[in-house]
């Protein structure tokens, strides 16, 4: 006869490990008992359980409620046991010793490998600002057994570097992603991808990049000279800029207060029916937490009753 078993049994932390041991013998042979033991290089051989053909399953008190036989139907020649709720400390070598008659005893050893799936965490780096040099965008850490693989999935150009720390029963891997911040990266996903044999599929954590910037300001609305004549309605100036965080807009008039009736609505300056009083230099002030920008325009409102005057529109930033 011979024993059918496995060299390595792999199980995920918390799952039940089936330790296989099947005696394949002649029809007239019987199994008296199967003794299971943990083989430890320091502590020697320690019995886990004994499956007795007549008196049933005996379990070492140290493994009480953790060792069971597989559910029925059971073959009398099957000495396999289930080790419930595998923990890291269960990892190691096991021995099954099958006592048969009349053939005698057979033994086999196997290794139990307990996979500890990682629970990754992603930590964003310091605030990103356009104009910085190479900067940490995010770091991702995952600890498991065996060591997990940590990579990055992104369209953003950057560099990644990894380091690992080995502990007695696991390894922690940290990967950092560095980049040179630019406004084009704003809102782009940066995904940490963790692979491990104990995971059915990769674990992914996505961080959305936020790059602080403030674009140059410009003013639109002076393109059509005909709009800037006395009596015209609906004339507006719109301040153009963009930024992260979104900027705030402020309108002022360089040569005095804003004329009465002129309304400020965010980035837009709305005029009442135009008069020559509305002529002047207007300044759009754009700011966010990162920076501020100004753009100024000169508005001259033409009186059509005064044919000696031409519309003179000057824009300056």
């Amino acid at each position: 006869g011979e024993l059918e078993t496995s060299d390595v049994v792999t199980v995920v932390l918390g799952q039940d490990a089936k330790l296989p041991c099947f005696y394949r013998g002649d029809p007239d042979e019987q199994v008296g008992q199967v003794a299971w033991a943990r083989v430890d290089p320091n502590e020697g051989i320690r019995e886990l359980a004994l499956l007795h053909s007549k008196y049933g399953l005996h379990v070492n008190p140290a493994y009480e409620d953790r060792v069971e036989q597989p559910p029925p139907p059971r073959d009398p020649l099957d000495g396999s046991v289930l080790l419930r709720n595998a923990v890291q400390a269960d990892e190691g070598e096991y021995e099954c010793r099958v006592s048969t008659f009349p053939a005698g005893s057979f033994q086999a050893r196997m290794r139990l490998r307990v996979l500890v799936p990682p629970l990754p965490s992603l930590n964003p780096g310091p605030p990103l600002e356009e104009g910085q040099g190479l900067t940490l965008a995010a770091s991702c850490t995952a600890e498991g057994s065996p060591a997990p693989s940590v990579t990055w999935d992104t369209e953003v150009k950057g560099t990644q570097s990894s380091r690992s720390f080995t502990h007695p029963r696991s390894a922690a891997v940290t990967s950092e992603f560095h980049l040179v911040p630019s406004r084009s990266m704003n809102g782009q996903p940066l995904t940490c991808v963790v692979s491990h044999p104990g995971l059915l599929q990769d674990r992914r954590i996505t961080h959305t990049l936020q790059v602080a910037f403030l674009a140059e300001a410009s003013v639109r609305g002076l393109e059509d000279q005909n709009l800037w004549q006395v009596g015209r309605e609906g004339a507006t100036l719109k301040c153009l800029s963009e930024g992260q965080p979104p900027p705030k807009y402020n309108w002022t008039r360089l040569d005095g207060p804003l004329p009465s009736g002129v309304r400020v609505k965010g980035d837009t300056l709305g005029f009442p029916p135009l008069t020559t009083e509305h002529s002047g230099v207007y300044v759009c002030h754009v700011s966010n937490e990162l920076s501020s920008r100004d753009s100024q325009v000169t508005v001259e409102v033409l009186d059509p009753e005064d044919p000696g005057k031409q519309v003179d529109l000057v824009s300056a930033s």
């Epitope: 019995e47 359980a49 004994l50 053909s53 007549k54 005996h58 379990v59 070492n60 008190p61 006592s99």
Partner: nanobody, 118 residues
Framework: EVQLVESGGGLVQAGGSLRLSCAAS????????MGWFRQAPAKQRELVTS???????RYADSVKGRFTISRDVAKNTVDLQMNSLKPEDTAVYYC????????????WGQGTQVTVSS
Amino acid sequence: EVQLVESGGGLVQAGGSLRLSCAASGSISSINLMGWFRQAPAKQRELVTSISPGGSVRYADSVKGRFTISRDVAKNTVDLQMNSLKPEDTAVYYCAAESERTYYFDSWGQGTQVTVSS
């Protein structure tokens, strides 16, 4: 041949404790399981608990959590600590040894009476 000698029986009130001991001599190298059986009047002899040379144990459902078997392989002894005793535990308790040649209990002690009064 294996000889088994028990000690420690007696009368105890319900809820009390008793400790039974059993010493083996003779052909002890052939012993595999050691255990305790009991037989109440007009009832079948039943296996209460047994223990392997490596310390693996099995208990009858009726005594789980109340009885504890221990074995000293070097001294060839097996003890049974009985706590929270009940009147239905009243019986003659037998120490038994199983030969690893036969895989059944074939050596028996003379028995010791345990009586639990209510």
